[in-house]
Interface confidence: low
């Protein structure tokens, strides 16, 4: 099979959605494309492969099979743990023992009522790993004006890169700093009159894979005088921090 990489590094092959053995003069169900399957490996603990079940013209329990191309794991496997949306299959969850990051993962979606209506995708799982958010954030004072932020990840540190954001209660926007594989960050000039807020997120890139997606943001951690009564930005920040993905 000749393969062409898509921009995110994934091969993406599907059954052609117009070809049926009967001439199709109307745009019938058999000519419809199947929804795209999106897979993400969460911290290499489990993988969710999901699709938009509402794109089907009528409620359809699509089935999913998978295998690994050109490997010892090339036996076709049925999904054993479906995810549902309004009682219709909308995904499949695979457990850790079924995940082989560095083999080509082949996933096939099929309409059981129209077996010819199937779509196959090939995915590079090492480009689809999303780590858990950094946790156990701690701040310590290194000197009168210097703060150090530390955190942990539930994954191999060398596989992750990290992004720190911080702001004071007087800032309109976050200041962002990439810290590579380090899991600490130093802020050299802290203003004792201001309230600081920090958060961190991580990405599986670039040593072990090339995932473009970041983890969720960590919980916020704060430092300094609390001046939120005088400044509305801190309230907005607290209320909306979960939307910064």
């Amino acid at each position: 099979l000749n393969t062409i990489l898509t921009p995110n590094g994934n091969e993406d092959t599907t059954a052609d959605f117009f070809l049926t053995s009967m001439p199709t003069d109307s745009f019938s169900v058999s000519t419809l494309p199947l929804p795209e399957v999106q897979c993400f490996v969460f911290n290499v603990e489990y993988m969710n492969c999901t699709w938009n079940s509402s794109s089907e013209p009528q409620p359809t329990n699509l089935t999913l099979h998978y295998w690994y191309k050109n490997s010892d794991n090339d036996k076709v496997q049925k999904c054993s743990h479906y995810l549902f949306a309004e009682e219709i299959t909308s995904g499949c969850q695979l457990q850790k023992k079924e995940i082989h990051l560095y083999q080509t993962f082949v996933v096939q979606l099929q309409d059981p009522r129209e077996p010819r209506r199937q779509a196959t995708q090939m995915l590079k799982l090492q480009n689809l790993v999303i780590p858990w958010a950094p946790e156990n954030l701690t701040l310590r004072k290194l000197s009168e004006s210097q703060l150090e932020l530390n955190w942990n990840n539930r994954f191999l540190n060398h596989c992750l890169e990290h992004l720190v954001q911080y702001r004071t209660d007087w800032d309109h926007t976050w200041t962002e700093q990439s810290v590579g594989h380090s899991h600490s960050f130093s802020l050299p000039s802290v203003d004792g009159q201001k309230h600081y807020t920090f958060r961190v997120r991580s990405r599986f890139n670039p040593l072990c894979g090339s995932t473009q997606h970041w983890s969720e943001w960590s919980h916020l951690i704060h430092w300094g005088s609390n001046t939120s009564k005088e400044n509305p930005f801190l309230f907005a920040l607290e209320a909306h921090h979960h939307h910064h993905h």
Epitope: L1, N2, I4, T6, D12, T13, T14, A15, D16, F17, F18, L19, T20, S21, P23, T24, F27, T31, L32, P33, P35, E36, N52, S55, P57, R116, A119, T120
Partner: antibody, heavy 120, light 112 residues
Framework: QVQLVQSGAEVLKPGASVKVSCKAS????????MHWVKQARGQRLEWIGG????????TYNQKFKGKATLTTDTSTSTAYMELRNLRSDDTAVYYC?????????????WGQGTLVTVSS | DIVMTQSPLSLPVTPGEQASISCRSS???????????LEWYLQKPGQSPQLLIY???NRFSGVPDRFSGSGSGTDFTLKISRVEAEDVGVYFC?????????FGSGTKLEIK
Amino acid sequence: QVQLVQSGAEVLKPGASVKVSCKASGYTFTEYTMHWVKQARGQRLEWIGGIDPNTGGVTYNQKFKGKATLTTDTSTSTAYMELRNLRSDDTAVYYCARRRRYYGYALDYWGQGTLVTVSS
Amino acid sequence: DIVMTQSPLSLPVTPGEQASISCRSSQSIVHSNGNTYLEWYLQKPGQSPQLLIYKVSNRFSGVPDRFSGSGSGTDFTLKISRVEAEDVGVYFCSQSTHVPFMFGSGTKLEIK
């Protein structure tokens, strides 16, 4: 690398039939559908239809039903298009094109084209 | 059948300038799954057509980033940010949301 090599030019008389071939290499033939496109001089490209070599399923442009018949031979990785009852307005270059099985659904590799000339 | 209308028919461009080609479909080519299957092809003189853009804005493998596609619903545009001599040829838009697939009439890009 992917290659689609078509049969040579044909000169035919009105009423005749012709079978154009398209030999595929560089990929697994049964995993992609094959489509045919007509390009008459000064006219826009016209999609004739497509065939799934895996199942033999065919979808035609209504305009070419009865004119074109699409088949494949998986043992030789070759697609065929037969044109029947040729008329002068069938004079054109005919292309085979592989349809990528991405969610982009596009004709990603094309043959070099076969010129069919119908003349009395 | 859906009609794909392209403009202009001819486009003379100075090397290094931007070129813009418009394509309009006679009805929406948004599929019920939310995707829009609109492609752009380039046919260089004496050659077969080649795929440039699929699904409105996705560049095909090996296509230079000076080519970009945009649009939605029924109106689509192909832009070439800095035209080079090798870009000459006829550009076709095509829809593959509905059967039959339909192509635009083509836009001939020429170097001034």
